[in-house]
Each structure stands twice: as C-alpha cells, then as structure tokens.
C-alpha cells in the first residue's frame, strides 16, 4: 500500500511551478469516471505537491488517482513522466481481507464507494469507533489491524488508522463498514448523503 501515492508525489514534485499550476487547471476540467467528484477549485489552486497528492488519493483513491494524474500529465505533453508514473504503480498488491470472498482478477476499476466519498468527514465525525471495530472484527479486520486501530489515542486517529487499511478492501468489505455506520451512526450517514 502507498506505492501509487509515492509515485504521484514523485511526479508532482518533478513539475516546475508553472507546470504544477497548469496541472491543477487541467484537473478542473479533465473528464472523470462516473461516481467521482471534482476537487473544489478554491482548495486546489493553493495546494503544493504534497497537499495535492493527499487530496488526489483521498478523492480518487490510489489506483484511479494515479491513472488520472498520468492522464493529465499526458495531456500536458509530459508523456515520459506519465509513463514512469504508470510503470511505478503497475506492481503487486496485497491479499484479500479476512472473511470475504476474494475476487477474481479483473481489469475493471470500481467507482467511488460512499465511505471513500466521505472519508474526511468520517475521520472527523465518527465517535463510536469501538463499535465499528467489533462489527468488522474477523470479517474485514484481522486481529493485528483491530488492535492497531484500538491503540490510537483519539477517535479521529482511530478512524485514520482504520482508513489506512481500506485501500486493500474490496467493495463488499466497504459495504460492511457502511452497514456498521448505518447501524451505529445513522444520523451521520444521512447527513453525509445530504451534503
């Protein structure tokens, strides 16, 4: 996990100030896959390479974030840099989480799940993390992961740790987290859907 993020960061840090500005402007109009939102213009234009990398990964996840970055770079005429980025991200991935049927290999890339759309708000606003952990334990979370999340001192840091595992999850794993949220913090889920 994190290889794609590092590759995006490497690519963006190698852009000149002018190229980074051009990258951001193109990102505002690049066609997006169905289900994905656009990074707000105001926030985008003031970001440095590190902030932009984090924003790309939180909005689009690592795989699609890297693909989107490569598309924009190619559109800017930076073919070699786009190629390097894609080469860096097309390397191995982790095992399927516990308790869920492992998917067959597929070229299809999934859209953005509700929990990925609202990652930042969930990190900030979920309060009963222990309840979520108990609901996910043995199905989605290993014992080691369960303990790692519990060891964090605050609810936001617990949720941040929990989200550090989600890039390895398939759609049904994410659905189990969403189910637990519907059960335990329904008002929050409703509020996020309205936002």
């Amino acid at each position: 996990m994190g290889r794609a993020r590092d590759a995006i960061l490497d690519a963006l840090e190698n852009l000149t100030a002018e190229e980074l500005k051009k990258f951001k402007l193109k990102l505002l109009s690049v066609p997006l896959r169905e289900g994905y939102g656009r990074i707000p213009r105001g926030a985008l234009l003031s970001m440095d390479a590190l902030d932009l990398t984090d924003k790309l990964v939180s909005f689009y996840l690592e795989t699609y974030g890297a693909e989107l970055t490569a598309n924009v770079l190619r559109d800017m005429g930076l073919q070699e840099m786009a190629g390097q980025l894609q080469a860096a991200t097309h390397q191995g991935s982790g095992a399927a989480p516990a308790g869920i049927q492992a998917p067959p290999q597929s070229a299809a890339k999934p859209g953005l799940h509700f929990i990925d759309q609202h990652r930042a708000a969930l990190i900030a606003r979920v309060t009963n993390v222990e309840w979520l952990l108990d609901a996910l334990y043995g199905k989605v979370l290993t014992d080691e992961q369960y303990q790692a999340v519990r060891a964090e001192p605050t609810n936001p840091s617990k949720m941040r740790k929990l989200f550090s595992f989600t890039p390895a999850w398939n759609w049904t794993c994410k659905d189990l987290l969403l189910q637990a949220l519907r059960e335990s913090q329904s008002y929050l889920v409703e509020d996020l859907e309205r936002s």
Partner: antibody, heavy 122, light 107 residues
C-alpha cells in the same frame, strides 16, 4: 435506458444445477452491484445476495450460502447466478435487480429483471 | 436477521378510500426502509425509499412515514391500478429482509 434482461424459464430435475443469466444494458455492468431475489408462489421475497462486478466480490445471505454462486462476465455485460443441488424448495421466480443510485448510503432497488421461473421436478 | 412484520396480510377497500399498511422491524432500522408494489404476474416496483422519499415517477397518492421500528405506507384516494401486493424491505443490515406482503383488493 437501464434494462436487465433475464434468461428464459427452466425446468430441471432434482439434484441438477442451473445457471440463470441477467444481461444489463444502458449502463456499465461494473458501475453497480447486482442483487438477486427469490420469490416462491404465494410467498414473499427473499434476498439471496449480491456481487459487485467492478471487483468480483460478493456477499451472500447465509440461508443461500452454498446454494447460490454469483458471478459476472464483463465482456458480455452479464451477471449470473448458479444454483446447485436443486430440490423442489428451489422452485421459484428469481429476479436480478440493481440499486437505483450509485455510491448511495444504502440500497433501494429501482431496476429489476423480468424474472426467471425455475421449476424443479422429476 | 432482522424480521419485518407487515400488517394486515390482506386488505379490501373501496375506490377513493385512504388506506394504511404498517411494517414493524424486530430491531431499530432508523430510516433504512423501502416500499415496493407488485401487481399480479409482474415485477416489484419501487415506491418509497428511505422511509418517506417518493421514488421518481411514483404517484403522489403514495406516502411513507416512520423511523426506528415502526413504518407506514399510506395510499390516498385509492384507484383501480393500485391493486397488488405491497412489500416493505429493510436496507440497513445484511441480509436484507422483506415483510410478508399486504395484498390489496378493491371492493
């Protein structure tokens, strides 16, 4: 527009297996999960499970685990449900269905196939 | 599994009547409830989602209310095309479960 077209009615013998298909059009199969429902005559609806063709993962109702297997073929935009070791209890109408909106906080089923009638009889 | 108990199981009413169907969940499902209509020999059709939201293209004579464990579907000014069986379905927790259905007939 969105359409889900299911395979025709099946008459099979006890102990056999069957594969029901659900061909989608009007959207990309990988964009939404496909759920399956069972309805026996004069009885209500039962949720069998779903699969997400975008990554091939599936979630089953424990009551149908081992009975139903859900798969998809992206190249033909078709989802499948394989039912094995059939008995008269499996005789029913089976529906494939799709949540109405993508990336929602929960599933509500706005699109349905026309149903496939399965009759298990010797 | 969450049990969904629907009542009545059958109902006969006159044209123009207002009728109410109730659905009781065995545990709190918040607002994660859907209502469907199934006409004889046809497929289920979504009427209401999230307990009270009217699905696109559905007549405003249908309305839903409730949260937690108690929910109602109300049909005002009953029309001949409203005959069929109505089902509630909880969408909070897997496995999703349906009520047993309410068969509506016209007197």
């Amino acid at each position: 527009q969105v359409q889900l077209q299911q395979s025709d009615a099946e008459l099979v013998k006890p102990g056999a297996s069957v594969k029901i298909s659900c061909k989608v059009s009007g959207y990309a199969l990988t964009d939404h999960s496909i759920h399956w429902m069972k309805q026996r005559p004069e009885q209500g609806l039962a949720w069998i499970g779903y699969m997400y063709p975008g990554d091939g993962s599936a979630n089953y109702n424990d009551k149908f685990r081992g009975k139903a297997t859900l798969t998809a073929d992206i190249s033909s935009s078709t989802a499948y449900m394989h039912l094995n070791s059939l008995t008269s209890e499996d005789s029913a109408v089976y529906f494939c269905t799709r949540p109405y909106s993508f990336g929602s906080s929960y599933d509500y089923f706005g699109y349905w196939g026309q149903g496939t009638t399965l009759t298990v009889s010797s | 599994d969450i049990q969904m108990n629907q009542s009545p199981s059958s109902l006969s009413a006159s044209l123009g009547d207002t009728i109410t169907i109730t659905c009781h969940a065995s545990q709190n499902i918040n607002v994660w409830l859907n209502w469907y209509q199934q006409k004889p020999g046809n497929i289920p059709k979504l009427l209401i989602y999230k307990a009270s939201k009217l699905h696109t293209g559905v007549s405003s004579s249908f309305s839903g209310s409730g949260s937690g464990t108690g929910f109602t579907l109300t049909i005002s000014s009953l029309q001949p095309e409203d005959i069929g069986t109505y089902y509630c379905q909880q969408g909070q927790s897997y496995p999703y479960t349906f009520g047993g259905g309410t068969k509506l007939e016209i007197k």
